[in-house]
């Protein structure tokens, strides 16, 4: 679960699993700075707000986030 | 099978020191937090630590903050926590658990920290 | 920081329903998991995300979660589930996780 208080890492466990896209509210990536030193994902879903850290080596999260941005693109006109 | 199984456990003086490991086996140790929670004799459940998947990140319950430090060896699977400064009031069952995000969906059986003189 | 308040028990009779009751300060906008520890042995996760399932936990175990209120509802009660319960959360503002006082469930 991320934790926003920190200015380190944020993610305490991360999912190999994707989520589905229809309960996503929101998904951020998150590039490595200075105060975390790797990609973190951050899917945010409808159900009250619940965070969930996904696994950027994950072949399937790969493969999520390739899916939700084929969508947007869709969407924008 | 998923297992967390905790070692370490003991009879310490106050001010002394104890170090509790465990050993988890079944799941991919490295993609996820671990907790440490304690049960004193007959109370409730208290959350102790956690720490992240990679070790960057780690909290601590106000009450051994400062005394007590979660780590994790990945290479290894296993779970540590290094319990300085002793009181009496440590005394109690100590389990690591799997974190869920934000739920606990796997214990160890637990090992019993004493302290007393 | 956050308190999460449970009745200390509750006596149920088998074949009935038992309600276990977990207040806490607009605890419905939060995520509440909750475990039953038996004598002698670790806690065990019943219900998580307010009123999902682990694989193995019986169809009789439900939970909900509004308002000031979270319950988990223990429907057929048998002897074996005679235990103490704690309800569970993730204090976002402090970054700690915090249970409940725990309720003692016994099977009259």
């Known amino acids: 679960v991320p934790l926003s208080r920190t200015v380190r890492c944020t993610c305490i466990s991360i999912s190999n699993q994707p989520v589905n896209p229809r309960s996503l509210e929101k998904l951020e990536i998150i590039p490595a700075s200075q105060f975390c030193p790797r990609v973190e994902i951050i899917a945010t879903m409808k159900k009250k707000g619940e965070k969930r850290c996904l696994n950027p080596e994950s072949k399937a999260i790969k493969n999520l986030l390739k899916a939700v941005s084929k969508e947007r693109s869709k969407r924008s006109p | 099978q998923v297992q967390l199984v905790e070692s370490g456990g003991g009879v310490v003086q106050p001010g002394r020191s104890l170090r509790l490991s465990c050993a988890a086996s079944?799941?991919?140790?490295?993609?996820?937090?671990m907790h440490w929670v304690r049960q004193a004799p007959g109370k409730g459940l208290e959350w102790v630590a956690v720490i992240s998947y990679d070790g960057s990140n780690k909290y601590y319950a106000d009450s051994v903050k400062g005394r007590f430090t979660i780590s994790r060896d990945n290479s290894k699977n296993t779970l540590y926590l290094q319990m300085n400064s002793l009181r009496a009031e440590d005394t109690a069952v100590y389990y690591c658990a799997k974190d869920e995000f934000d739920a606990f969906d796997i214990w160890g059986r637990g090992t019993m920290v004493t302290v007393s003189s | 920081s956050y308190v999460l308040t449970q009745p200390p028990s509750v006596s149920v009779a088998p074949g009935t329903t038992a309600r276990i009751t977990c207040g806490g300060n607009n605890i419905g906008s939060r995520s509440v998991h909750w475990y039953q520890q038996k004598p002698g042995q670790a806690p065990l996760l019943v219900i998580y995300y307010d009123s999902d399932r682990p694989s193995g936990i019986p169809l009789r175990f439900s939970g909900s979660n509004s308002g000031n209120t979270a319950t988990l509802t223990i429907s057929r009660v048998e002897a074996g589930d005679e235990a103490d319960y704690y309800c569970q959360v993730w204090d976002t503002s402090s970054g700690h996780y915090v249970f409940g006082t725990g309720t003692k469930v016994t099977v009259l």
């Open positions: 079944g799941f991919t140790f490295s993609s996820y937090g």
